[in-house]
């Protein structure tokens, strides 16, 4: 889904009220620690020397909903996610680096503690490089492991 064109445009009027999540996880892993803003996430990543994983999604997107379920139920991904600073966003940030090839959802972008967006860590779709589908959990897991190999280890 390309959010530049149709972000939230198809919501039923009854659904226009924002749904307040029980936690910042919004269902992506209630046992994990999630940051609230991109700025906070960047700060935590830099100070803790842990990579940042940013998940862009929309509540009313079927592919976001589907990926969320497999992500939350995948034990290995949930375990590995503990080693990241985590942020999931239902809106776009002003940082264009987080949308190297467009503002579609769902997409997952990794950021190094050096605050470099890992544009090299991509999914399997040439037209949407940072998109993942439920069948891509093995690739996502491998990409998370790649992101844990930091660009530059700070002493």
């Amino acid at each position: 889904k390309d959010t530049t064109v149709k972000s939230g445009a198809k919501k039923d009027p009854k659904d226009s009220r924002p749904k307040l999540p029980q936690t910042l996880s919004r269902g992506w892993g209630d046992q994990l620690i999630w940051t609230q803003t991109y700025e906070e996430a960047l700060y935590r990543s830099k100070t803790s020397n842990r990579p940042l994983m940013v998940i862009h999604h929309l509540d009313e997107c079927p592919h976001s909903q589907a990926l969320k379920k497999v992500f939350a139920e995948h034990k290995e991904i949930q375990k590995l996610a503990e080693q990241f600073v985590l942020l999931n966003l239902v809106y776009e940030t002003t940082d264009k680096h987080l949308s190297p090839d467009g503002q579609y959802v769902p997409r997952i972008v990794f950021v190094d503690p050096s605050l470099t967006v890992r544009a090299d860590i991509t999914g399997r779709y040439s037209n949407r490089l940072y998109a993942y589908e439920p069948s891509d959990t093995a690739l996502l897991y491998d990409n998370m492991k790649k992101a844990l190999k930091l660009l530059k280890t700070e002493l």
């Epitope: 079927p62 589907a66 139920e73 949407r128 589908e133």
Partner: antibody, heavy 120, light 107 residues
């Protein structure tokens, strides 16, 4: 093998309610989306909505939001479609259709359909 | 909502001939399109998902192509059991929507 077995035909009066069941087997029930689709006599297909049996999350076609309710019972691997305040125009065959085996949204397996007739 | 337009409404062909069915979306749906076959009194059967992926157990004479807004289902050589109604479905965004169907009938 995957099986979706739906409950039998129903004849109801306008204003009544009906609950159609779809009993599943042959896969992990809680980890595939279940869709409901309807087909009025001689007409095409319409998507009603879907439910994730693992946690009960739902999404409805706005057209079916008011009187249609999807639910799931993990203990018997069954999903349900309940329609209240039935109208003559609800007369249709109702199908359950499982999402992709990996949790993807596409519709893979279909139940045999349940005919609901609403007539006074 | 996204509108899917199928054409032609009816296709009259003989066994052994090639069938080409079209499905056009009112907006870009990436590759999130499925094709179904339905015979009278039966449930639909899924043939293709993600525009071009053949479902297990479906004969190789069925193939799907396209992305964005224009999609095609091709049956390379019609068998007697292929005469039926074919529907496309988009599952890119809610609500999922079906095309109006193409009836493939014996000439």
């Amino acid at each position: 093998q995957v099986q979706l077995v739906q409950s039998g035909s129903e004849l109801k009066k306008p204003g009544a309610s009906v609950k159609v069941s779809c009993k599943t087997s042959g896969y992990v029930f809680s980890r595939s989306w279940m869709n409901w689709v309807r087909q009025a006599p001689g007409q095409g297909l319409e998507w009603i909505g879907w439910i994730y049996p693992g946690d009960g999350d739902t999404n409805y076609n706005g057209k079916f939001k008011d009187r249609f309710v999807l639910s799931a019972d993990k203990s018997v691997s069954t999903v349900y479609l309940q329609i209240s305040s039935l109208k003559a125009e609800d007369t249709a065959v109702y199908f359950c259709a499982r999402g992709g085996y990996d949790g993807s949204p596409w519709l893979s397996y279909w139940g045999q359909g349940t005919l609901v007739t609403v007539s006074s | 909502e996204i509108v899917l337009t199928q054409s032609p409404a009816t296709l009259s062909l003989s066994p052994g001939e090639r069938a080409t069915l079209s499905c056009k979306a009112s907006q870009d749906i990436n590759s999130y399109l499925s094709w179904f076959q339905q015979k009278p009194g039966q449930a639909p059967r899924t043939l293709i998902y993600r525009a071009n992926r053949l479902v297990d157990g479906i004969p190789a004479r069925f193939s799907g192509s396209g992305s964005g807004q224009d999609f095609t289902l091709t049956i390379s050589s019609l068998e007697p059991e292929d005469f039926a109604v074919y529907y496309c479905l988009q599952y890119d965004e809610f609500p999922f929507t079906f095309g109006g169907g193409t009836k493939v009938e014996i000439k």
